[in-house]
């Protein structure tokens, strides 16, 4: 009788986290009697996965019937496999004895697991940032297996080439981290921006995972100011606008200044939005010019989400021309001030005033 | 250890029945066969029956098909023996005895329970 | 159903002397290149032990001087040099089918 062989006739096994390993072996003899273990590495630290004789081993079954006569076949199945499980597996065959002794070993199994990455999590900066700043954005996804992976960075489409990627643990381990980060310059129109990190693995077939940033949360676009002055409205009255074109976000807050002093502050609420999704807003004051003895300077103060505050200025001229039109002249005369502002474009129908 | 440990003497009448345990320890009860075997005073070794715990399959010696039946208690690794309408030669010693290599064989065996049939 | 016989019923050996037991079956035991043959020992008072399994393979913890031979329908169980403590009834058993026993063969000292 030929000595019994234990045979593992796949070298390596390749299994989807969740799925079952299957492990195949089969001895080549029923001489000696005695039972199967399968272990996890080799040596004195190996790991018992399966005793045939005692034990308590609920994610494995055996493949064939093993009490069945004249069996042979000791394969087994390993459920709900997880990266952890990922080694070589070796089939044992032992020899009855007080205690079992080992007799023979199968080559071994290399278990490796498949686990695909978590869905990419892209981070932007801490605080916003102007245009033509350049800001980083980093890109992290986990637990996959194996080590191989393709990383990918766009934005609005078009992939970037600015960034640096590192993928943890350098040596074996049941499963690897990626952590990327890449540089984006950012321009006045990408308040509809998207920066995309693009994730591709074995495990996800050819379908990668993606990972987004919107820039709105990223960008700070100032607003540019421009104060006007309209033609008359009503004797001795002048409405001077301020209009606050393309910013973002909208938080917002405008103040009046007459001659250096605050007449008037408000919150920009409606707002019109651009486009390229930055908002402009406009706020406008009636001036009673006949309260005004001398030349008025009047400033349209704006500070723009928490920013240091700019403004624009506009000489409003006094002159003894009461109903001359023109940018910076108005009638003198006494009265009070009406103050006001709209979003709307057409201001003569369907602003609001305010009397003090 | 395998080991397999068996319940006490017992003295019955013709006609009645028995039931012999055989409580198994130091292995997966599920992954053997267990075999029964008598031994009448000063005789030879005669096979009863055998049983797989793990389903629950049985092979009885034809001898024995229509008194004889094997049970398994998983949840203790107990299995049992019951012989019915006894006779007096059904007097002897029952062993059990445990299969380790699925060859029909029997590795381990009990101590025996030696059953008196007597009037 | 295979039928074993064993051959003498009883064995008065001298010690140290060659003990020889045989078991002939009614019909082959031999499958798949195995002879499903085995052999006990039963000493007085105590459970059989197994000495022997599929026809010549020494069972764990058994003494080297015993040894099983044979194939197909013709077995035999040698001890090669007897030790008073052999002393014993040996059986031998098949499971080619349905296992049975021989009927015995008692082994004294001469």
């Known amino acids: 009788e030929e000595e019994l062989q234990v045979i593992q006739p796949d070298k390596s096994v390749s299994v989807a986290a969740g799925e079952s390993a299957i492990l195949h072996c089969t001895v080549t003899s029923l001489i000696p009697v005695g039972p199967i273990q399968w272990f996890r590495g080799a040596g004195p630290a190996r790991e018992l996965i399966y005793n045939q004789k005692e034990g308590h081993f609920p994610r494995v079954t055996t493949v064939s019937e093993s009490t069945k006569r004249e069996n042979m076949d000791f394969s087994i199945s390993i459920s709900n496999i997880t990266p952890a499980d990922a080694g070589t597996y070796y089939c044992v065959k032992f020899r009855k004895g007080s205690p079992d002794t080992e007799f023979k070993s199968g080559a071994g199994t290399e278990l490796s697991v498949r686990a695909k990455p978590s869905a990419p999590v892209v981070s932007g900066p801490a605080a916003r940032a102007t245009p033509q700043h350049t800001v980083s954005f980093t890109c992290e996804s986990h637990g996959f297996s194996p080590r191989d992976i393709t990383l990918k960075w766009f934005k609005n489409g078009n992939e970037l080439s600015d960034f640096q990627t590192n993928v943890d643990p350098v040596g074996e381990s049941v499963s690897y981290s990626i952590h990327s980060t890449a540089k984006v310059v950012l321009t006045r129109e990408d308040v509809h921006s998207q920066v995309i990190c693009e994730v591709a693995h074995v495990t996800l077939q050819g379908d990668p995972l993606r990972g987004t940033a919107n820039l709105s949360e990223t960008i700070r676009v100032p607003p540019t100011l421009e104060v006007t002055q309209q033609p008359v409205r009503a004797e001795n009255q002048v409405n001077v606008t301020c209009q606050v074109r393309k910013f973002y976000p909208q938080r917002l807050q405008l103040t009046w200044l007459e001659n250096g002093n605050v007449s008037r502050t408000e919150t920009a609420s409606t707002v019109t939005e651009n486009k390229d999704g930055t908002y402009n807003w406009m706020s406008w004051l009636l001036v009673n010019v006949s309260a005004h003895r001398d030349d008025v300077k009047l400033t349209c103060q704006v500070e723009h989400d928490g920013q240091p505050a700019v403004s624009k200025s506009h000489d409003l001229k006094v002159s003894a021309h009461p109903k001359e039109q023109g940018s910076n002249t108005a009638a003198e005369n006494t009265g009070s001030n009406e103050r006001g502002s709209s979003d709307y474009k057409d201001d003569d129908d369907k602003h609001h005033h305010h009397h003090h | 250890q395998v080991q397999l440990v068996q319940s006490g003497a017992e003295v019955k009448k013709p006609g009645a029945s028995v039931k012999v345990s055989c409580k198994a320890s130091?292995?997966?009860?599920?992954?053997?066969?267990i075999n029964w075997v008598r031994q009448a005073p000063g005789q030879g070794l005669e096979w009863i029956a055998m049983i797989d715990p793990s389903d629950s399959e049985t092979h009885y010696n034809q001898i024995f098909k229509d008194r004889a039946t094997l049970t398994t208690d998983t949840s203790t690794s107990t299995a049992y023996m019951e012989l019915r309408s006894l006779r007096s030669d059904d007097t002897a010693v029952y062993y059990c005895?445990?299969?380790?290599?699925?060859?029909?064989?029997?590795?381990?065996w009990g101590r025996g329970t030696l059953v008196t049939v007597s009037s | 159903d295979i039928v074993l016989t064993q051959s003498p019923d009883s064995l008065a050996v001298s010690l140290g002397e060659r003990a020889t037991i045989n078991c002939r079956a009614s019909k082959s035991v031999s499958s798949s290149g195995y002879n499903y043959i085995f052999w006990y020992q039963q000493k007085p008072g105590q459970p059989p032990k197994l000495l022997i399994y599929?026809?010549?393979n020494l069972d764990s913890g058994v003494p080297d001087r015993f040894s099983g031979s044979g194939s197909g329908t013709d077995f035999t169980l040698t001890i090669s040099s007897l030790q008073a403590e052999d002393v014993a009834v040996y059986y031998c058993?098949?499971?080619?089918?349905?296992?049975?026993f021989g009927q015995g063969t008692k082994l004294e000292i001469k």
């Open positions: 005895a445990m299969d380790y290599g699925s060859l029909y064989a029997m590795d381990y």
């Open positions: 599929l026809a010549s």
């Open positions: 058993q098949h499971s080619r089918d349905l296992p049975t």
């Open positions: 130091g292995y997966t009860f599920t992954n053997y066969w």
